[in-house]
């Protein structure tokens, strides 16, 4: 056996393996405090104890032991605001993107035992504490129930709930995925007196039905009311119930603004302003007009009033209202004025202050960059994130505006904290922003820190991923560059992942990873060790991600370029970028591939079928193939309606099937999960049918009973192994 040769430190590093990726060997941790006051928070420790922390007294103790958690197999918890009870969540069963059902147990912290009598039914679709005390609201079998105390009998608030027909307090499929982005549709008033909720009536919505094979003799059929483009939509109503005496008055319906109610519309969000003031946002089905309506409780008639002079209209003349969603208001202490992000006259999304009318709004931020999210408004400060710093759209820094000052002064809280390591932040604030946690996602190793809300001083490092740092020491990681390229009057930001021993004088295969959906962003300054990191590290492939027209945070001119014509500029801009990359001199023109998932699968398919000859091969995972097959709220936001008098022509022209002939000269791998509730298997079935009809050869793989994420461990392993083989074959890389 030959003796081991000593290698100096520099050469002992190894490349990433596919196994590393599939095992999650190099996954990172973040730390988000579960705030319970101005200076106190809870956190679940590594060993599953729920630990209480007080920042000011520095005390910490176990509030709920892992043995109590384990006794009911709990995976999550929630402390009641009066700190007397904790709900324990177990039997988690995923439904759609956000929704799941679970079993809930209530633990009495005073007595140290579970609450017996009037136990909660199972499985529950949603459960939450009131903001004050320990009232419980929950949704069971599409109806809302209320408990004044955990041991009390429940009071049934709604009776209309019916599976797949009427949903109370929880959204239906399309609202969950495309509008609310939550599993709930109920909101407590700040003092816990009122409970607002939405009723979704899906009775007239067409059903998507697909087989779930399981392991029985017969497959079962999954039925989901799912409105595709142009179909009948859910009918929504918003109600508010007085939870102090729910039986006395019953739920009161909140009126829809007249200008919205005159045609099909959506409810988009609800924000409690004070204990007797609520703000509702509505959107026309043609999603270029949004109305924010402020409603007040009138004691005399015990009714909710939404006067016309408290309706604020937001309209887009160049595209759709809002970004991906219409932004929500952040109200001031006066409970009348608010801050909101919307497009300024130059088409950049910025913070505006609305006191009386939108027309008289005062612009708070401005510039050729975008304000992205308002985290918190306090008496004297407003905290927000933006991509202003140094002009990189893919960064996120946190800023504080001192609103007490005149003019308001602005400070970047994060820009210079750990400049090399951290350029992409989010934040989590305690009550009244006395303290906050910063979570940095990269480009270096993620780090979570605790800060003083007055001085912004760092108090403590909460998580710095030391173990990950150590385990990466002996790994040859690729080099990541974020740069921009220009074409005509357009600027495209790109991220390039270069193999460890990259040499500009050599030629490398190129893989384009694309998403490209409206208001998305792929070029972000974040840390990641994933499949494409492996492809660069081990297989010597150059990876590039490009944000073309239609992507976010670079102004409405860039964003709205794709309005009513999806599938054109997103593809064109990927092709432009590839040509520019070839000009750089280190790309092997004969070995260029493209891959994408979901919207990215649509773009990669269209790019492969562009007839340019740029791509040798490509992969589409769970692609959309026609916007008529996708959800109404999403498709119509960007494409209008598939009707003759609206945009049917482009709906038809923009399908993957229409380009079937053009796949003849590329190697195409088409992949889809058969139980995809989001982008239905129908999309890939139709691509396959068109390719067969055109007598075009292609490769395909389906994943039985897998959804849009193809998330099961076995499926993920198979998927990435299969795609790796396909790419290596395409690029003539030895196994």
């Amino acid at each position: 056996r030959p003796s081991r040769v000593y290698k100096p430190e520099g050469n002992t590093k190894r490349a990433l393996t596919l196994k590393d990726i599939l095992n999650g060997t190099f996954s990172y941790k973040t730390y988000f405090p579960n705030w319970i006051s101005e200076q106190e928070y809870l956190h679940q420790s590594e060993d599953d104890n729920i630990v209480f922390y007080n920042i000011e007294t520095r005390e910490s103790y176990i509030i709920l032991s892992n043995s109590t958690m384990k006794s009911v197999n709990a995976t999550d918890y929630g402390l009641s605001p009066d700190r007397q009870f904790v709900y324990l969540e177990s039997d988690y069963s995923k439904l759609w993107r956000y929704s799941y059902t679970a079993t809930y147990y209530i633990y009495d912290l005073q007595n140290g035992e579970f609450v017996r009598g009037y136990e909660l039914p199972r499985p529950i679709q949603y459960l939450c504490w009131s903001p004050v005390g320990s009232k419980l609201a929950y949704v069971y079998q599409n109806n809302i129930y209320l408990k004044q105390r955990p041991g009390d009998p429940p009071f049934q608030i709604t009776y209309t709930g019916r599976e797949n027909r009427i949903f109370n307090g929880i959204p239906d499929w399309v609202y969950e995925e495309e509008m609310l982005a939550t599993k709930y549709a109920l909101w407590w008033s700040p003092d816990g007196k009122f409970l607002a909720y939405v009723e979704f009536n899906d009775s007239d919505i067409p059903i998507i039905a697909y087989s779930y094979y399981g392991d029985g003799q017969y497959p079962r059929t999954i039925n989901i009311p799912y409105p595709k483009a142009g179909a009948k939509n859910p009918v929504v109503r918003v109600f508010i119930v007085d939870t102090t005496y729910p039986h006395h008055v019953g739920p009161m319906e909140v009126p829809v603004p007249e200008m919205i109610a005159s045609s099909d519309y959506y409810f988009s969000w609800l924000t409690w302003v004070s204990s007797e003031r609520v703000c509702l946002q509505w959107l026309k089905r043609v999603q270029n007009v949004s109305v924010l309506s402020i409603c007040d409780f009138r004691e005399d008639w015990h009714a909710w009033e939404c006067p016309k002079n408290q309706e604020h209209v937001e309209e887009s003349r160049t595209g759709w209202a809002g970004g991906f969603f219409v932004s929500t208001p952040a109200f001031s202490q006066d409970a009348t004025s608010y801050y909101k992000i919307f497009s300024d006259k130059d088409g950049y999304k910025h913070i505006h202050y609305i006191k009386d009318t939108v027309e008289n709004a005062i612009q708070i931020t401005s510039g050729k960059w975008e304000a992205i999210y308002i985290f918190r408004v306090t008496q004297d400060s407003l905290f927000y994130s933006s991509n202003e710093f140094e002009g990189y759209p893919g960064r996120r820094n946190i800023y504080r505006i001192s609103i007490g000052n005149s003019p308001p002064s602005k400070k970047c809280v994060t820009c210079h904290l750990r400049k090399e390591r951290c350029q992409y932040y989010t934040a989590s604030f305690s009550y009244k922003a006395k303290y906050y946690a910063l979570v940095c996602y990269g480009p270096g190793l993620p780090i979570s820190t605790l800060h003083d809300g007055r001085t912004d001083q760092e108090i403590q490092v909460l998580e710095e991923n030391k173990e990950l740092e150590n385990s990466l020491r002996n790994i040859q990681l690729p080099k990541v560059e974020i740069k921009k390229l220009k074409d005509g009057g357009l600027t495209f930001w790109y991220k390039m992942i270069l193999p460890p021993q990259f040499d500009r004088s050599k030629k490398y295969p190129l893989l384009i990873q694309v998403y490209g959906g409206p208001c998305s962003q792929s070029v972000k300054s974040v840390f990641a060790v994933n499949w494409i990191t492996y492809l660069a590290s081990k297989e010597g492939i150059v990876i590039a991600l490009v944000d073309g027209r239609g992507t976010a945070f670079q102004g409405d001119k860039f964003l709205h370029a794709v309005y009513r014509k999806l599938g054109v500029y997103e593809v064109e801009d990927q092709l432009t970028a590839v040509r520019k990359f070839i000009e750089m001199g280190f790309i092997d023109e004969e070995r260029i591939a493209i891959w994408g998932w979901s919207y990215g699968g649509y773009v990669s398919s269209l790019a492969l079928a562009s007839g340019t000859g740029l791509f040798k091969c490509g992969i589409a995972v769970a692609p959309v193939s026609s916007w008529e097959y996708y959800a109404s709220i999403y498709s119509e936001r960007f494409m209008g309606l598939p009707t003759k008098d609206d945009n049917l022509e482009h709906y038809k022209n923009s399908t993957v099937m229409a380009r079937a002939e053009y796949f003849r000269n590329v190697d195409y791998l088409l992949i889809h999960g058969t139980a995809d509730d989001n982008v239905h298997f129908q999309n890939s079935a139709q691509i396959a049918k068109a390719l067969v009809n055109a007598q075009v050869d292609f490769q395909a793989m389906w994943y039985s009973d897998q959804n849009h994420g193809i998330l099961s461990g076995r499926s993920q392993n198979h998927l990435y192994t299969h795609m790796t083989h396909f790419l290596k074959q395409c690029f003539s890389l030895s196994d």
């Epitope: 009161m252 909140v254 909710w304």
Partner: nanobody, 121 residues
Framework: EVQLVESGGGLVQPGGSLRLSCAAS??????????IGWVRRAPGKEEELVAR????????RYADSVKGRFTISCDTSKNTAYLQMNSLRAEDTAVYYC????????????WGQGTTVTVSS
């Protein structure tokens, strides 16, 4: 033009019953912005909202003085609201007005012409 027309008033003995009707025209009582109420005025007493209903949601509210005795309801097909008054007492004697209130603007209330209810033996 909005109109509210009440009917059903009259003389009744204590313990008796009456049903008041309020026929609305010019607006839709099943609209979520509409509340219908019965307001009574008696000499020397403060005006009192005895009951109100939001027909769209079926949400009802009663003054403590009539709780358990009066029932407010609506028939949206007839665009009419009702007040069923049982176990009437002498102190229920008053002119009963039907009032229509819009949740989109509380600056105005539509009123009917009123119907008199007299409870006396």
């Amino acid at each position: 033009e909005v109109q509210l027309v009440e009917s059903g008033g009259g003389l009744v003995q204590p313990g008796g019953s009456l049903r008041l009707s309020c026929a609305a025209s010019g607006f839709n009582i099943k609209d979520s912005s509409t509340y219908i109420g019965w307001v009574r005025r008696a000499p020397g007493k403060e005006e009192e909202l005895v009951a109100r209903i939001q027909c769209s949601a079926g949400s009802t509210r009663y003054a403590d003085s009539v709780k358990g005795r009066f029932t407010i309801s609506c028939d949206t097909s007839k665009n009419t609201a009702y007040l069923q008054m049982n176990s009437l007492r002498a102190e229920d004697t008053a002119v009963y007005y039907c009032a229509g209130r819009s949740a989109r603007s509380y600056s105005y209330i539509y009123w009917g012409q009123g119907t008199t209810v007299t409870v006396s033996s």
